[in-house]
Amino acid sequence: VPRWRQQWSGPGTTKRFPETVLARCVKYTEIHPEMRHVDCQSVWDAFKGAFISKHPCNITEEDYQPLMKLGTQTVPCNKILLWSRIKDLAHQFTQVQRDMFTLEDTLLGYLADDLTWCGEFNTSKINYQSCPDWRKDCSNNPVSVFWKTVSRRFAEAACDVVHVMLNGSRSKIFDKNSTFGSVEVHNLQPEKVQTLEAWVIHGGREDSRDLCQDPTIKELESIISKRNIQFSCKNIYRPDKFLQCVKNPEDSSCTSEI
């Protein structure tokens, strides 16, 4: 008799998930000698233990604590780059500006980036067919809880000037419902963080508007100011030129506004 299986609205676990997580852990320790003390088998066992045999709508931050402990990592607290709805450019930036870090440049972020996973209550199986969708099914699913947990910890670690890259092409440049808007903004520590500097990335070539005056940016400024953190904002009119100038700051064209 075939066992009844819950059908969720979201895509199932990424194929070859265990191997992918293990492979990423190996690669990360290869690239980052300071993390060679990390036991990748223990990391995978802790990752799996966070969601296997548990109802995928009943995952808690506590479930991920063993993994968080194993993945503890010190990044320079004044070199943190947050992002919202513009991940690719943020990652391109930190690949060039090697002393700055997005969450996905840390071990735990690197392990899980772009992956989906979930289990089933009372079975040791990974569900490759479907996983809960945050909106249609439940918010306390394995993927959402993971990102909420690591994002909170990442924001809590930040100090001095924290940068955030925002997508100027979106209708809501700052979205209160994004991970940045709902988790990271509220977990920056005012006693450590002096300034949040937003970089608003323009999409159109001819777009010369000052998107720092956008109502959603003003809303962000208000939230941040109420938390006793200073706020500043810069328009990045030409993201392609911006990246080029990060690579080659001596270039003569890099003195003008980007």
Epitope: P18, E19, L22, A23, C25, V26, K27, T29, E30, R36, H37, V38, D39, C40, Q41, S42, W44, D45, K48, S124
Partner: nanobody, 122 residues
Framework: EVQLLESGGGLVQPGGSLRLSCAAS????????MSWVRQAPGKGLEWVSG????????YYADSVKGRFIISRDNSKNTLDLQMNSLRADDTAVYYC???????????????RGQGTLVTVSS
Amino acid sequence: EVQLLESGGGLVQPGGSLRLSCAASGFIFSSYAMSWVRQAPGKGLEWVSGISNTGINTYYADSVKGRFIISRDNSKNTLDLQMNSLRADDTAVYYCASGKGWDGNTWYEDYRGQGTLVTVSS
């Protein structure tokens, strides 16, 4: 270029001991899980024992549990297998292998050496 070079095989009497070694080069040894696998004459490959990249976790097939001990030295890029209380059915070519790790009974292997022959016979 990844190289895994096994040594220490030979002829040993039942009940005897042998220590196999594997010298690794061409990759960052301390990042990889390592295993010993074996192939008896006319049989398929059998996973024997494994160790995680830092050495914290060790694993053994039921057939060798309590008799074999796996260890590694990340400062020397070496993997060892101490084989005690050897039996005739331990006769096989023993291979050193590097990989990502395990999920349950699945070993995710990347590279394997050429092997060393262990013969247990009186």
